[in-house]
């Protein structure tokens, strides 16, 4: 058993049928010595008397808010949550496996640049009685500071019969140098509590590996005289690290017909312009990627050929 | 990645082309190592990230773009010293800091070159003959060093009398390649920045 926060305790249980569970001793936070009784949640049934209460915690029915009273007055509370260990592996019931970029990915994180600011998100099908708290650091043995905001519900979508909820959090490394070569990964830890179930999820990454630039901005077409060709031009996104000559991007320019089956013409360039043939009803899209470290491509920025 | 290879024009900062080749070569070598050593811990998540140049050179600090010198987090360990000649210095206006930067890059390359050559000698003794260093990568390191053209003491190749532990050598190779790739990215960024300046 360990304390999650004041008066909230997590009981770790080896979770299998007929498991013996864990013996827990609760102590009433009071100078009083006698006349103390204990109850669980809203029930008025007295579970025991005395300054301490010993319970065998086996299942969720044994978890909840234990309260000690004296003469009708509440003295203190202890909330017990359960953390299930199933065959040596902590349960992951609360969050959905996003399966990207690999199986068992519960937290996904992205950064728009090298400033040390990043966003993480996760999915769940649970809509109520759910709380998250997020902590982060650079390295784990001698951790350096990363400050995270509160997790917020950022999207809701319907998936088949289920509603899916996306939560996200923004974090900022306290003293980040965009040009630094990372040797210690960023660690992100999310505590999730659903009703009386506690779970924790972690992700470890280097900012360089989660970079995903914003799409190029100001995408424009300039027709070339007496030609089917157009000059496409764009700019670096505002959110990208500066100076751009140091934090350079490379670009992919794509000409896509109306039909998805039509052959796509693609050109790769380090410049912020390219000359392409603009077909009727086609659209031109440009995306960006760090020129020197191949992390994710940005989403496409698009304009119609017409 | 299907990127066209840029051919530098003659007036271009002479080292940019070499640094692009370096990054390409080390990235290819790392990919090859990951595939060949699939049963060894060779991914970014599995290895310890060590920097053999730590406390010996200060490339990131010495090569910091002017725009980032205002960022206090980037100025934790700025050091000044090093040699100040070199053929990449295209104009007399080149500052002391630029010379310092390029000489730091040269020292990095020299240290990695020695490590890689020592490691290759060990790998050649492996009865499994599982993996060797790409000669192209070693050649590209050499070319960039020549283009930087700093006069510096030659570091003797380390020789070891004891029987090599091939498992440890291959893990060390992965660690070295990951670190060298990160340094090659920094070198490319620096060359691109200097070229634009």
């Amino acid at each position: 058993i360990w304390e999650l926060k004041k008066d909230v305790y997590v009981v770790e249980l080896d979770w299998y049928p007929d498991a013996p569970g864990e013996m827990v001793v609760l102590t009433c936070d009071t100078p009083e010595e006698d006349g103390i009784t204990w109850t669980l949640d809203q029930s008025s049934e007295v579970l025991g008397s005395g300054k301490t209460l010993t319970i065998q915690v086996k299942e969720f029915g044994d978890a909840g808010q234990y309260t000690c009273h004296k003469g009708g007055e509440v003295l203190s509370h202890s909330l017990l949550l359960l953390h299930k260990k199933e065959d040596g592996i902590w349960s992951t019931d609360i969050l959905k496996d996003q399966k990207e970029p690999k199986n068992k990915t519960f937290l996904r994180c992205e950064a728009k640049n090298y400033s040390g600011r990043f966003t993480c998100w996760w999915l769940t099908t649970i809509s109520t009685d759910l709380t998250f708290s997020v902590k982060s650091s650079r390295g784990s043995s001698d951790p350096q500071g990363v400050t995270c905001g509160a997790a917020t519900l950022s999207a809701e979508r319907v998936r088949g019969d289920n509603k899916e909820y996306e939560y996200s959090v923004e974090c900022q490394e306290d003293s980040a140098c965009p040009a630094a070569e990372e040797s210690l990964p960023i660690e992100v830890m999310v505590d999730a509590v659903h009703k009386l179930k506690y779970e924790n999820y972690t992700s470890s990454f280097f900012i360089r590996d989660i970079i995903k630039p914003d799409p190029p901005k100001n995408l424009q077409l300039k027709p070339l005289k007496n030609s089917r060709q157009v000059e496409v031009s764009w700019e670096y996104p505002d959110t990208w690290s500066t100076p751009h000559s140091y934090f350079s991007l490379t670009f992919c320019v794509q000409v896509q017909g109306k039909s998805k089956r039509e052959k796509k013409d693609r050109v790769f360039t380090d410049k912020t312009s390219a000359t392409v043939i603009c077909r009727k009803n086609a659209s031109i899209s440009v995306r960006a990627q760090d020129r020197y470290y191949s992390s994710s491509w940005s989403e496409w920025a698009s304009v119609p050929c017409s | 990645r299907n990127l066209p290879v840029a051919t530098p024009d003659p007036g271009m900062f002479p080292c940019l082309h070499h640094s692009q080749n370096l990054l390409r070569a080390v990235s290819n070598m790392l990919q090859k190592a990951r595939q060949t050593l699939e049963f060894y811990p060779c991914t970014s998540e599995e290895i310890d990230h060590e920097d053999i140049t730590k406390d010996k050179t200060s490339t990131v600090e010495a090569c910091l773009p002017l725009e980032l010198t205002k960022n206090e987090s980037c100025l934790n360990s700025r050091e000044t010293s090093f040699i100040t000649n070199g053929s990449c210095l295209a104009s007399r206006k080149t500052s002391f800091m630029m010379a310092l930067c390029l000489s730091s890059i040269y020292e990095d390359l020299k240290m990695y070159q020695v490590e890689f050559k020592t490691m290759n000698a060990k790998l050649l003794m492996d009865p499994k003959r599982q993996i060797f260093l790409d000669q192209n990568m070693l050649a590209v390191i050499d070319e960039l060093m020549q283009a930087l053209n700093f006069n510096s003491e030659t570091v003797p190749q380390k020789s070891s009398l004891e029987e090599p532990d091939f498992y440890k050598t291959k893990i060390k190779l992965c660690i070295l390649l990951h670190a060298f790739r990160i340094r090659a990215v920094t070198i490319d960024r620096v060359m691109s920045y200097l070229n634009a300046s």
């Epitope: 080896d14 979770w15 007929d18 040596g88 592996i89 199986n103 068992k104 | 811990p41």
Partner: antibody
Framework: QVQLVQSGGGVVQPGRSLRLSCAAS????????MHWVRQAPGKGLEWVAF????????YYADSVKGRFTISRDNSKNTLYLQMKSLRAEDTAVYYC????????WGQGTMVTVSS | SYVLTQPPSVSGTPGQRVTISCSGG????????VKWYQQLPGTAPKLLIY???QRPSGVPDRFSGSKSGTSASLAITGVQAEDEADYYC????????????FGTGTKVTVLG
Amino acid sequence: QVQLVQSGGGVVQPGRSLRLSCAASGFTFSSYGMHWVRQAPGKGLEWVAFIRYDGSNKYYADSVKGRFTISRDNSKNTLYLQMKSLRAEDTAVYYCKTHGSHDNWGQGTMVTVSS
Amino acid sequence: SYVLTQPPSVSGTPGQRVTISCSGGRSNIGSQTVKWYQQLPGTAPKLLIYGNDQRPSGVPDRFSGSKSGTSASLAITGVQAEDEADYYCQSYDRGTHPALLFGTGTKVTVLG
């Protein structure tokens, strides 16, 4: 004490269907994940499928994906394995078992796929 | 499709020490716990070892498990006639959990 009693095995022709059941007692069935494991005659153990305690997630071995469906009825304390498009290579003793560091197995039920 | 490799058979005389190996990889035994089962003819498997080296109550202490790197082993010190059975190791793969990975199985024969 924990008990898992299996039923539903038998002889079936290739291409036909069969449903296996596993009745649980002696524990809170709705709190635990459950597996199906099979063993072809004279062969080793092979995992078939898993279902979470609440039925929200199901996992299958590649060899049965798209043909077998694992399900549970927590109100009846019963686990099921619906097997469709059966093949000769599905012939095996099928076991249900609880998920956890200490596990309990059903007695096994024989499924023979033969024409 | 078996990723965990065991020797097909091992044998020993009563009282001898018998060991069975189970070889896997970094993503299974290397990073997950291992179980061992005993299966007597015509019966369901019985758990002998969980969590690499833990014995459930009721399992004789002549059975012991260990794990090192990407391999695990089961030792029977002072093997007895009633130990003649098939033995299976089981683990998970970190990418496909909760799918169970079973070893190929080892037939233990007690001679004499």
